[in-house]
């Protein structure tokens, strides 16, 4: 498979690997995104690790109010994440790839 | 890098070894998307590669109607791709990394 | 500390549309707070109506959907309800009322609530 | 919606009793309730949410317990100013839902 092909993949199973850990496992539960976060998005996470800070974000995540996160959700934060990745990306544009 | 952080780097990477082809290299034109499309992802292509079919995506994916993809528009592209791979991920639950 | 104003007219005539607005005060329009609207019959029961939040994200009561709007402004730290199509069963106090991101997101806030009655 | 029940509808009591009042939930709500308390004239308080969590400024004779569709709140030893309607708010799902208010009164 091409690398955006395994990409999203990634996100597909990574969603997955945490969401079927506790009650409904098409869904992420508070400590659920909890471990996603710390062990799959550590660079994002930084020190942020505080009960108030992963609260704010959960709630921020859940759309539809259910206190879980569903995989519309999520994806929508790696959106954000990854929109916060490309402003990162545009103001250094020595950076990349290529010029035109 | 996690492979999660990975794929988020890959989503950004891709889009603008594409973007940066022609025009403003912070969007996508159409054939830049077209080209994006061919090379990276073949699997969710597949055969569909008439006229109509691209220019019928490229206006779903133009959101802000400037006959150009943005970063944005491309991630929600992305997400929707992604919703269905979990879509089919989920119709199959023997492929479940864990069960509840 | 956080405080919440409702304000808006008193008497609405049936058929025509309420409209309030909540002022926020000690606290800005954060992503992190939903803003509700609840009100209360005066048989006491209350019925929530639905709150706006983080991205402009809205949720409506199903009952209520098709005759309800909520806005909010963000540079006034106000957010409004609009109930179009008014009877008398829409008499009530109308609550506007912070929603804390803790677990079960509950109303941490409340304004004091202004009485609406529906009546020609 | 989550049709949310709660009893008694009132009930007589003196300072310093024990005062328990239930609530049930038409399906399971996960801990996710949270309580009131409404004395004449004015808005709601929060009390506790997510079941036993006590919210700020909140005096330790509340509790709250539960699981599943049945909770229940607690006052240890009821004083002067507890005389009030209390109300069940179940935050599990869209729409919030109330129950019917349990009215607190001096025996």
């Known amino acids: 498979a091409c690398p955006l092909e395994k990409a999203l993949d990634v996100m597909v199973s990574t969603f997955h690997k945490y969401s079927g850990k506790e009650g409904d496992k098409f869904k992420l539960n508070k400590s659920e995104l909890k471990e996603l976060l710390t062990r799959e998005l550590p660079s994002f996470l930084g020190k942020r690790t505080d009960e108030a800070a992963f609260q704010k974000l959960m709630s921020n995540l859940d759309s539809n109010r259910d206190n879980e996160v569903d995989f519309q959700e999520y994806c929508v934060f790696l959106s954000c994440i990854a929109m916060m990745c490309n402003e990162f990306f545009e103001g250094f544009p020595d950076k990349q790839p290529r010029k035109k | 890098a996690c492979p999660l952080e990975k794929a988020l780097d890959v989503m950004v990477s891709t889009f603008h070894k594409y973007s940066g082809k022609e025009g403003d290299k912070f969007k996508l034109n159409k054939s830049e998307l077209k080209e994006l499309l061919t090379r990276e992802l073949p699997s969710f292509l597949g055969k569909r590669t008439d006229e109509a079919a691209f220019q019928k995506l490229m206006s779903n994916l133009d959101s802000n109607r400037d006959n150009e993809v943005d970063f944005q528009e491309y991630c929600v592209f992305l997400s929707c791709i992604a919703m269905m791979c979990n879509e089919f991920f989920e119709g199959f639950p023997d492929k479940q990394p864990r069960k509840k | 500390q956080v405080q919440l104003q409702e304000s808006g007219p008193g008497l609405v005539k049936p058929s025509q549309t309420l409209s309030l607005t909540c002022t926020v005060s000690g606290d800005s329009f954060t992503n992190d707070y939903y803003w509700n609207w609840i009100r209360q019959f005066p048989g006491k029961k209350l019925e929530w109506i639905g709150h706006i939040g983080y991205g402009g994200n809205i949720n409506y009561n199903p009952s209520l959907k098709n005759r309800l709007s909520m806005s909010r402004d963000t540079s006034k730290n106000q957010f409004s309800l609009k109930l179009s199509s008014v009877t008398a069963a829409d008499t009530a106090v109308y609550y506007c009322?912070?929603?804390?991101?803790?677990?079960?997101?509950?109303?941490?806030?409340w304004g004091q609530g202004t009485l609406v009655t529906v009546s020609s | 919606d989550i049709q949310m029940t709660q009893s008694p509808s009132s009930l007589s009591a003196s300072v310093g009793d024990r005062v328990t009042i239930t609530c049930r939930a038409s399906q399971d709500i996960r801990n996710y309730l949270n309580w009131y308390q409404q004395k004449p004239g004015k808005a709601p308080k929060l009390l506790l949410y997510y079941t036993s969590r006590l919210h700020s400024g909140v005096p330790s004779r509340f509790s709250g317990s539960g699981s599943g569709t049945d909770y229940t709140l607690t006052i240890s030893s009821l004083q002067p100013e507890d005389f009030a309607t209390y109300y069940c708010q179940q935050g599990n799902s869209l729409p919030r839902t109330f129950g019917g208010g349990t009215k607190v009164e001096i025996k």
């Open positions: 009322t912070r929603e804390s991101f803790y677990d079960g997101y509950p109303f941490d806030y």
